[in-house]
Amino acid sequence: MMTGTIETTGNISAEKGGSIILQCHLSSTTAQVTQVNWEQQDQLLAICNADLGWHISPSFKDRVAPGPGLGLTLQSLTVNDTGEYFCIYHTYPDGTYTGRIFLEVLESSVAEHGARFQIP
């Protein structure tokens, strides 16, 4: 039975040209995390693998920094970066846990962070 929950940074907003940290955390399970994938809609941004380390997709290499922790830092944000982001935790023996973050990139300086929420 999958008992874990993923806490994410929730719905967040940031200014165009700035940067943002996407964070997820898996709790309430003793399952071993073997890999974390970061995806934007259906596009792979980055992978953190226990044995192989970080892999950043070539198309994002200039704008994505690994971390902090198992998170991902997006830099030089554009309005086109607005959308859904997913952290996918591959674990043993539980299987896969997925967290969702919605990022809105704003033209103005009214960017504010939304509340955290949990996905079972």
């Epitope: 995390v33 953190c48 920094a65 922790g69």
Partner: antibody, heavy 117, light 107 residues
Framework: QVQLQQSGAELVRPGTSVKISCKAS????????LGWVKQRPGHGLEWIGD????????NYNEKFKGKATLTADTASSTAYMQLSSLTSEDSAVYFC??????????WGQGTLVTVSA | DIKMTQSPSSMYASLGERVTITCKAS??????LSWYQQKPWKSPKTLIF???RLADGVPSRFSGSGSGQDFSLTISSLESDDTATYYC?????????FGGGTKLEIK
């Protein structure tokens, strides 16, 4: 297997600089953060900063900004730390360490830096 | 910066005894905590990573627990080889910080 081989001990004059190295083997150098830690005799461990060779990203402990400069040469899988304007307070053993959240850290053997006139 | 408060700073324990060292973070660090063992004139050795995971080659008498702010390292049955200084390290966000260390000696 993962190995981090550090350069040898250094005896340097106050006010000068020193550059120490950490050669990595047994893994893909560009895929992992490589950190540096300071230990003075009788003291604990102090985190200086780290570098991600795959993109050149760096993080520094505010205390070491202006003192330490971290670089990496992906061709030789070697990380470097330059320490500038040396004083007796910089006399210490410096460790490099390959850090990863999901498997724990591997450590170099340490490099002793002695600052003395 | 996140402050890591480690206790005790030193302790004596008997062979076969159960030993627990604690680390408290000044704020929530999730599971981003590691434990290291260091012997004099040696490099630190990773014991526990991601708060609870045993590093390769580390004896099963070592275990880690905790999440959020409170963490502990337990040695279930102390052996003579365990004489060393133990450090916790948070590595969730820069700057990473070590606890002050716990010097463990045999009674």
């Amino acid at each position: 297997q993962v190995q981090l081989q550090q350069s040898g001990a250094e005896l340097v004059r106050p006010g000068t600089s020193v550059k120490i190295s950490c050669k990595a083997s047994g893994y893909t150098f560009t895929n992992f953060w490589l950190g540096w830690v300071k230990q003075r005799p009788g003291h604990g461990l102090e985190w200086i900063g780290d570098i991600f060779p795959g993109g050149g990203h760096t993080n520094y402990n505010e205390k070491f900004k202006g003192k330490a400069t971290l670089t990496a040469d992906t061709a030789s899988s070697t990380a470097y730390m330059q320490l500038s304007s040396l004083t007796s307070e910089d006399s210490a053993v410096y460790f490099c360490s390959r850090s990863t959240i999901l498997t724990g850290a591997y450590w170099g053997q340490g490099t002793l830096v002695t600052v003395s006139a | 910066d996140i402050k890591m408060t480690q206790s005790p700073s030193s302790m004596y324990a008997s062979l076969g005894e159960r030993v627990t060292i604690t680390c408290k973070a000044s704020q929530d660090i999730k599971s981003y905590l590691s434990w290291y063992q260091q012997k004099p004139w040696k490099s630190p050795k990773t014991l526990i990573f991601y708060a609870t995971r045993l590093a390769d080659g580390v004896p099963s008498r070592f275990s880690g627990s905790g999440s959020g702010q409170d963490f502990s390292l337990t040695i279930s049955s102390l052996e003579s080889d365990d004489t060393a200084t133990y450090y916790c390290l948070h590595h969730g966000e820069s700057p990473y910080t070590f606890g002050g260390g716990t010097k463990l000696e045999i009674k």
